[in-house]
């Protein structure tokens, strides 16, 4: 009695069960009462990846360089060629028939996952405490600058697109203000001295005075900080004098490079 169903890897034809062709081979002749199914190997540019009764092998996929494709894995008689995209591109679909450039993450967004030949860039919004000010397919969100670690204070808050702006603290502000105040005082004192000298040269009256040796007057002796041995003073922003700490140079601090 002719079979109605066949074993695995067989097919029913002309009331008999014939063996399917193995992967890498195509069907040429069905089995007969006397011979097994005749199968032929696929040619070099063809493949069949399953047990089959196909009379033609499938052509290997062509990785078209004009579409940005290149061969990732060469096809065999049993497997298709696997294409991938050139650097900077990724597949448009799962079948990878053409490629498109990787997406860049806009400012305010950072790269969560860098693109591959088969997947696009995955962007994520920069969370609080992070920012991205560039459009990039590689850069992650960067953390805001920590002003504290540089002995600075936040002068302008950061956003998802901008970094924080750090500024000097009160003490550092003093280092800027003190020399300015000192400079102003010095100029005033000079002006006063010049004025006093001019006044001193004017004759008081017409009566003659006894001739006196001109006495050198050092007006600077009374000026605060004129003693070279004494510590240089600093002033706070209120222009009140403060003593310069030992071991510190009396100069405006230069902010370190990041």
């Amino acid at each position: 009695e002719p079979p109605t169903a066949c074993r695995e890897k067989q097919y029913l034809i002309n009331s008999q069960c014939c063996s399917l062709c193995q992967p890498g081979q195509k069907l040429v002749s069905d089995c007969t009462e006397f011979t097994e199914t005749e199968c032929l190997p696929c040619s070099e540019s063809e493949f069949l990846d399953t047990w089959n009764r196909e009379t033609r092998c499938h052509q290997h996929k062509y990785c078209d360089p004009n579409l940005g494709l290149r061969v990732q894995q060469k096809g065999t008689s049993e497997t298709d060629t696997i294409c991938t995209c050139e650097e900077g591109l990724h597949c448009m679909s799962e079948s990878c028939e053409s490629c498109v450039p990787h997406r860049s993450c806009l400012p305010g967004f950072g790269v969560k996952q860098i693109a591959t030949g088969v997947s696009d860039t995955i962007c994520e919004p920069c969370p609080v405490g992070f920012f991205s000010n560039v459009s990039s397919a590689f850069e992650k969100c960067r953390p805001w600058t920590s002003c504290e670690t540089k002995d600075l204070v936040v002068q302008q808050a950061g956003t998802n697109k901008t970094d924080v702006v750090c500024g000097p603290q009160d003490r550092q502000r003093a280092l800027v203000v003190i020399p300015i105040c000192l400079g102003i005082l010095f100029v005033i004192l000079l002006l006063v001295l010049v004025f006093i000298k001019k006044v001193a040269k004017k004759p008081n009256d017409k009566a003659p005075h006894p001739k006196q040796e001109p006495q050198e007057i050092n007006f600077l002796d009374d000026l605060p900080g004129s003693n070279p041995a004494a510590p240089v003073q600093e002033t706070l922003h209120g222009c009140q004098p403060v003593t310069q700490e030992d071991g510190k140079e009396s100069r405006i601090s230069v902010q370190e490079r990041q």
């Epitope: 009462e33 011979t35 005749e38």
Partner: antibody, heavy 112, light 112 residues
């Protein structure tokens, strides 16, 4: 009506060659593997060659490998057997067969 | 693969009797897919062989139902339920499962 008709046999000297032909009709020739079977006088049948339906695969017993060549022309429904380096023991009636059907045979005699 | 038939030479029978011929292969001729290419042929005097049974037990078209085949693995049998005069000749078993294909030595069915 299936018909297989051999030709090309004859008397040949040892070391000589012949090309046997078999004209097939009455069935779809290309779908069937074809064989040549020989029979020496008063002896058993001996299978000497087979070719697959497409002509791609060929099979021989060790006794004739390298000396006999089976081939087919599916366009003309013809089977061939080229026999060379013939020996006296190759003397036999050569049958063309699809296993289901057999021709009447052609006689090959190898003699000095 | 060696195919051994018995009786080895002849089997004398009376017309109308049952006849049985055995064939044993030196190794299994069952393929992994379950197919067994065991065939039985009858060669009448002066004729080419004719197919009777294929794949162990399948009667070829036009073969009378008094012929039946059975067996598996390495042991096979051809039975003729009621022998008729036209059945006389030499019976050969043949294995087409493994190259080189081989025939049995033949059993001559003759009248007692």
């Amino acid at each position: 009506q299936v018909k297989l008709e051999e030709s090309g046999g004859g008397l040949v000297k040892p070391g000589g060659s012949l090309k046997l032909s078999c004209a097939a009709s009455g069935f779809t020739f290309r779908n069937y593997a074809m064989s040549w079977v020989r029979q020496s006088p008063g002896e058993r049948l001996e299978w000497v060659a087979e070719v697959s339906g497409s002509g791609y695969y060929t099979y021989y017993p060790d006794t004739v490998t390298g000396r006999f060549t089976i081939s087919r022309d599916n366009a003309n429904n013809t089977l061939y057997l080229e026999v060379s380096s013939l020996r006296s023991e190759d003397t036999a009636m050569y049958y063309c067969t699809s296993r289901a059907y057999w021709g009447q045979g052609t006689l090959v005699t190898v003699s000095a | 693969i060696v195919m051994t038939q018995s009786p080895t030479l002849s089997l004398p029978v009376s017309l109308g009797d049952q006849a049985s011929i055995s064939c044993r292969s030196s190794q299994s001729i069952v393929l992994t897919n379950g197919n067994t290419y065991l065939e039985w042929y009858l060669q009448r005097p002066g004729q080419s062989p004719k197919l009777l049974i294929y794949k162990v037990s399948n009667r070829f078209s036009g073969v009378p139902d008094r012929f039946s085949g059975s067996g598996s693995g390495t042991d096979f049998t051809l039975k003729i339920s009621r022998v008729e005069a036209e059945d006389l000749g030499v019976y050969y078993c043949f294995q087409g499962s493994h190259v080189p294909y081989t025939f049995g030595g033949g059993t001559k069915l003759e009248i007692k």
